[in-house]
């Protein structure tokens, strides 16, 4: 004799996060009387999705009309589908008692959900860093299923190989996340430039997600100095001038000493750009050689990013004999890097 | 989709009698058939449903008075030991109550219980 | 086990009018909602209006409506035609499967 049978067609159903899942489940009887209920797992822990006796499941509603008269459809639709629904639901047909007694379950139809991972976001040190330093770059994103996904890094659309990456839980879970460290060694080129992770997913249509940091906001590129002496612009006056070059980032401070002495602290302000992305400035210095009885030593002191400072002098010489009406100053450079 | 009952007559007390109601228009395996009668100048009363061998089941005053069989097309409710109180129209429905109500409805065969 | 009693035993109604009959259960029915309603013509078979306590079965008029849950359940005819006048039985279902209890009928008389 035929008994009734619990079918559920489907083994199993992916369904993208925020979408509606149908599950599917057709009995072959009308008999014995009493409801289908839907649970999420198995044994005595399981989840109860849906009962067509009683109670109220806002996210759940019957694809066919349950209260229709030979109804046998017993297929349901679960609204805005989150990873936290994944797993195996089942139908079963409970006989009408005090209590309802379960009768027969169906087979179960196991639901995966597919869960775009977030924007990965990338990190870089803490601390700027001078060229020829490897710096590590941190990239992360979060709540992905299922748990295959693709991590690529590049360095101005070349790719990187210095990486390591994890993806967690390494068991089943209802979503993942992902963590990767890379490895990038900077150069003076490198303030416009840019490090990217690029993460690739099923969820993604082949269109992957990309975070990025640039490398301005990561590299300290120190000011190379040089001190020159400009011919005289007026009588007794001699004009230095202190060549800041290839400097990133812009905040410097520059100090002039005079034989040791404080003469002028400024800040650069009317920087020039270069197409690297590193900045010039000059300062400059007029000296009244007059003044002076003795040789003046001149010190360009250059204070980049809160670094310890960089300096660099020039020594004007000052001729012994007395000076005539409108005849140069010797002067000869002997600058040196002093730091 | 059809239900009609037959085999009502005139029985003495205490002789069994066997009512078939004969279905078209469905399957058997996926519905129960059940039985109410109708006493004369009286209201309906469920008597049982027969669906599969492990769902037959009758009302408690039922039980033991009546039982049931089926095959492919037809359900049986056989009166064990009828008394003349017996006496109704019995009526043959598809469903078995709830979310299947009794519909439709056979015309009802006559059964008379005499001495 | 589960008793059904239905009131009023007999109504009459003029064409036009409204008619309803109240079904009492002595205990709530299986799932609030087992409860369905026959109108049965003299010589002729019950025929099914109502189940599961508001769902109009297929055919039937919308002027025949019901209403209730637990306990207390009501079938209205609205606008009662001359073909209304029959009996009208409730049919209450218990938690266990063989609990089904007709209630005593009503009897509309259609003026």
């Known amino acids: 004799e035929e008994e009734l049978q619990v079918i559920q067609p489907d083994k199993s159903v992916s369904v993208a996060a925020g979408e509606s899942a149908i599950l599917h489940c057709t009995v072959t009887s009308l008999i014995p009387v009493g409801p289908i209920q839907w649970f999420r797992g198995a044994g005595p822990a399981r989840e109860l999705i849906y009962n067509q006796k009683e109670g109220h499941f806002p996210r759940v509603t019957t694809v066919s009309e349950s209260t229709k008269r030979e109804n046998m459809d017993f297929s349901i639709s679960i609204s805005n589908i989150t990873p936290a629904d994944a797993g195996t639901y089942y139908c079963v047909k409970f006989r009408k008692g005090s209590p309802d007694t379960e009768f027969k379950s169906g087979a179960g139809t196991e639901l995966s959900v597919r869960a775009k991972p977030s924007a990965p976001v990338v990190s870089g040190p803490a601390a700027r860093a001078t060229p020829q330093h490897t710096v590590s770059f941190t990239c992360e994103s979060h709540g992905f299923s299922p748990r295959d996904i693709t991590l690529k890094w590049f360095k101005n659309g070349n790719e990187l190989s210095d990486f390591q990456t994890n993806v967690d839980p390494v068991g089943e879970s209802v979503s993942y996340s992902i963590h990767s460290t890379a490895k990038v060694v900077l150069t003076r080129e490198d303030v416009h430039s840019q490090v990217i992770c690029e993460v690739a997913h099923v969820t993604l249509q082949g269109d992957p997600l990309r975070g990025t940091a640039n490398l301005s906001e990561t590299i300290r590129v120190p000011p190379t100095l040089e001190v020159t002496q400009q011919p005289v612009r007026a009588e007794n006056q001699v004009n230095v001038t202190c060549q800041v070059r290839k400097f990133y980032p812009q905040r410097l401070q520059l100090t002039w000493l005079e034989n040791g002495n404080v003469s002028r602290t400024e800040t650069a302000s009317t920087v020039t750009e270069n197409k690297d992305g590193t900045y010039n400035w000059m300062s400059w210095l007029l000296v009244n050689v007059s003044a002076h009885r003795d040789d003046v030593k001149l010190t360009c002191q250059v204070e980049h990013d809160g670094q310890p400072a960089v300096s660099k002098s020039h020594d004007l010489k000052v001729s012994a004999h007395p000076k005539e009406q409108g005849s140069n100053t010797a002067a000869e450079n002997t600058g040196s890097n002093e730091r | 989709r059809s239900v009609e009952e037959s085999g009502g007559r005139l029985v003495t007390p205490g002789t069994p009698l066997t009512l078939t109601c004969t279905v078209s228009?469905?399957?058997?395996?996926?519905?129960?058939i059940s039985w109410v009668r109708q006493a004369p100048g009286k209201g309906l009363e469920y008597i049982g449903t027969?669906?599969?061998?492990?769902i037959t089941y009758f009302a408690s005053w039922a039980k033991g008075r009546f039982t049931g069989s089926k095959t492919s097309t037809t359900v049986d409710l056989k009166i064990t030991s009828p008394t003349t109180e017996d006496t109704a129209t019995y009526f043959c429905?598809?469903?078995?109550?709830?979310?299947?109500?009794?519909?439709?409805w056979g015309p009802g065969t006559l059964v008379t219980v005499s001495s | 086990a589960l008793v059904m009693t239905q009131t009023p035993a007999s109504v009459s109604a003029a064409v036009g009018g409204t008619v309803t009959t109240k079904c009492q259960a002595s205990?709530?029915?299986?799932?609030?909602?087992?409860l369905a309603w026959y109108q049965h013509k003299p010589g002729q078979p019950p025929k099914l209006l109502i189940y599961?306590?508001?769902t109009l079965a297929t055919g039937v008029p919308s002027r025949f409506s019901g209403s209730g849950s637990g306990t207390q359940f009501t079938l209205t005819i609205t606008g009662v035609q001359s073909d209304d006048a029959a009996t009208y039985y409730c049919?209450?279902?218990?938690?266990?499967?063989?609990?089904?209890?007709f209630g005593g009928g009503t009897e509309v008389v259609v003026k």
């Open positions: 049919l209450g279902g218990g938690d266990d499967e063989a609990d089904n209890v």
């Open positions: 228009g469905f399957s058997l395996s996926s519905h129960g």
């Open positions: 599961l306590a508001s």
């Open positions: 429905a598809r469903g078995s109550a709830w979310n299947d109500p009794f519909d439709p």
């Open positions: 027969i669906g599969t061998g492990v």
């Open positions: 205990q709530s029915v299986y799932g609030n909602n087992d």
